[in-house]
């Protein structure tokens, strides 16, 4: 739950949270830093590093919730990236590790800052959720399917094949981070 | 509306402590990031680090780090920006703002509050 | 950490006049993926906290009149002021968020000519 009072208007809460949406799709923010970090930086590895379907909820699947179903949908799904981040960050090498083999420390920093980062943005779906529950005009919940379950890594023989499963979760997070904007967009 | 009001200015000799305060209203506290901002008299706004108040995560600038300790206390929507030992160099007018995701642009500004380190 | 250098340090325009101001980082702060600039400019009148004009490079926070637009991509960025008004004296400021440490551009003082 939130802390602190929430925004009682709409307008001003879906443009921050378009605002924050827009912020943290960019590879830029995450995937990019996880590959430099992880030595995936080559263009035949990058080729690897592509979504699996049906990790992440599509465009199309989160245009065809009502809004609470979406906002449960989406709360859900970011509570399984939290998951997977806190693995994904638990086998990054430390600072001092990073700074030996001549690595930029801003972007471990990038990726420990998306934890907190996606907190924030959960907190800003709980007070929508909040102001959409106290509407007179508040649509009937459609639940949205498939974000219950985190999306898995498949079995991972080696540290390789784990770091490419982390890159392949990371550009599934970004899609869906875009698709998530585009879909409060249209509020 | 939102709202971040900052404490008092602050007028205190070389090597004592301080903490100032900075408290978030008219909106979640822990949707957000807090940073904090100086501006030496006359110049320009220089990052010193930025804090998530949901979990007390923090960052600070490489120039800033062991100089000053930044905190947060959810419970009560203050964010805290603090130092053990000032210097006469530390006479600043010191900003909090909001920031929507780390890092970013920062959104809402606290009024400042200006710190006098003089013996 | 990526520096911002603004020009000029400060500009004289007669009211109704355009002013602008330029501001250059040493890397760029475009987006991989989204095409999203990570820099914003801000307005700091005497004795105020500066105040957020516009976001990435281009788009005007709310409630800030339509004369001050942004623009440029990359490295390189501009802030237009297309008619020059007696409150916007101010100094104004860049400030990238493509990475930590944040750092701002040195500031553009405005006066009136």
């Known amino acids: 739950a939130a802390i602190g009072s929430c925004s009682k208007e709409y307008r001003v809460l879906l443009g921050q949270l378009q605002k924050q949406t827009d912020l943290m799709q960019d590879t830029s923010r995450l995937l990019d830093p996880y590959i430099r970090i992880q030595g995936l930086d080559v263009p035949k590895l990058r080729e690897h590093c592509r979504e699996r379907p049906g990790a992440f909820p599509s465009e199309e699947t989160l245009r065809g919730l009502g809004r609470r179903g979406f906002l449960q949908t989406l709360n859900a799904t970011l509570g399984c990236v939290l998951h997977r981040l806190a693995d994904l960050e638990q086998r990054l090498p430390k600072a001092q590790d990073l700074e030996r083999s001549g690595l930029n420390i801003e972007d471990l920093e990038k990726l420990q800052m998306a934890r907190p980062n996606i907190l924030g943005l959960r907190n800003n779906i709980y007070c929508m959720a909040q102001l959409l529950d106290n509407s007179d005009t508040a649509e009937p919940t459609k639940a949205g399917r498939g974000a219950s379950q985190p999306p898995t890594p498949t079995p991972a023989s080696d540290a390789f094949q784990r770091k490419l499963e982390g890159c392949r979760f990371l550009h599934g997070y970004h899609r869906f981070m875009h698709s998530v904007g585009r879909v409060f967009s249209k509020w | 509306e939102v709202q971040l009001v900052q404490s008092g200015a602050e007028v205190k000799k070389p090597g004592e402590s301080l903490k100032i305060s900075c408290k978030g209203s008219?909106?979640?506290?822990?949707?957000?990031?807090i940073s904090w901002v100086r501006q030496m008299p006359g110049k320009g706004l220089e990052w010193m680090g930025i804090?998530?108040?949901?979990?007390?995560?923090?960052r600070y600038s490489p120039s800033f780090q062991g100089q000053v300790t930044i905190s947060a206390d959810k419970s009560i929507s203050t964010a805290y920006l603090q130092w053990s030992s000032l210097k006469a160099s530390d006479t600043a007018m010191y900003y909090c703002?909001?920031?929507?995701?780390?890092?970013?642009?920062?959104?809402?500004w606290g009024q400042g509050t200006l710190v006098t380190v003089s013996s | 950490d990526i520096v911002m250098t603004q020009s000029p340090d400060s500009l004289a325009v007669s009211l109704g006049e355009r002013a602008t101001i330029n501001c250059k980082s040493s890397?760029?702060?475009?987006?991989?993926?989204?095409?999203?600039?990570?820099l914003a400019w801000y307005q700091q009148k005497p004795g105020q906290p500066p105040k957020l004009l516009i976001y990435s490079a281009s788009t005007r926070e709310s409630g800030v009149p339509d004369r001050f637009s942004g623009s440029g991509s990359g490295t390189d960025f501009t802030l237009t002021i297309s008619s020059l008004q007696a409150e916007d004296v101010a100094v104004y400021y860049c400030?990238?968020?493509?990475?930590?440490?944040?750092?701002f551009g040195q500031g553009t003082k405005v006066e009136i000519k």
């Open positions: 890397q760029s702060v475009l987006g991989s993926s989204s095409n999203i600039n990570f």
């Open positions: 400030q990238q968020y493509f990475s930590t440490p944040i750092t």
């Open positions: 703002a909001r920031v929507p995701v780390s890092p970013a642009y920062l959104d809402y």
């Open positions: 804090i998530y108040p949901g979990d007390s995560y923090t």
């Open positions: 008219g909106y979640s506290f822990t949707s957000y990031w």
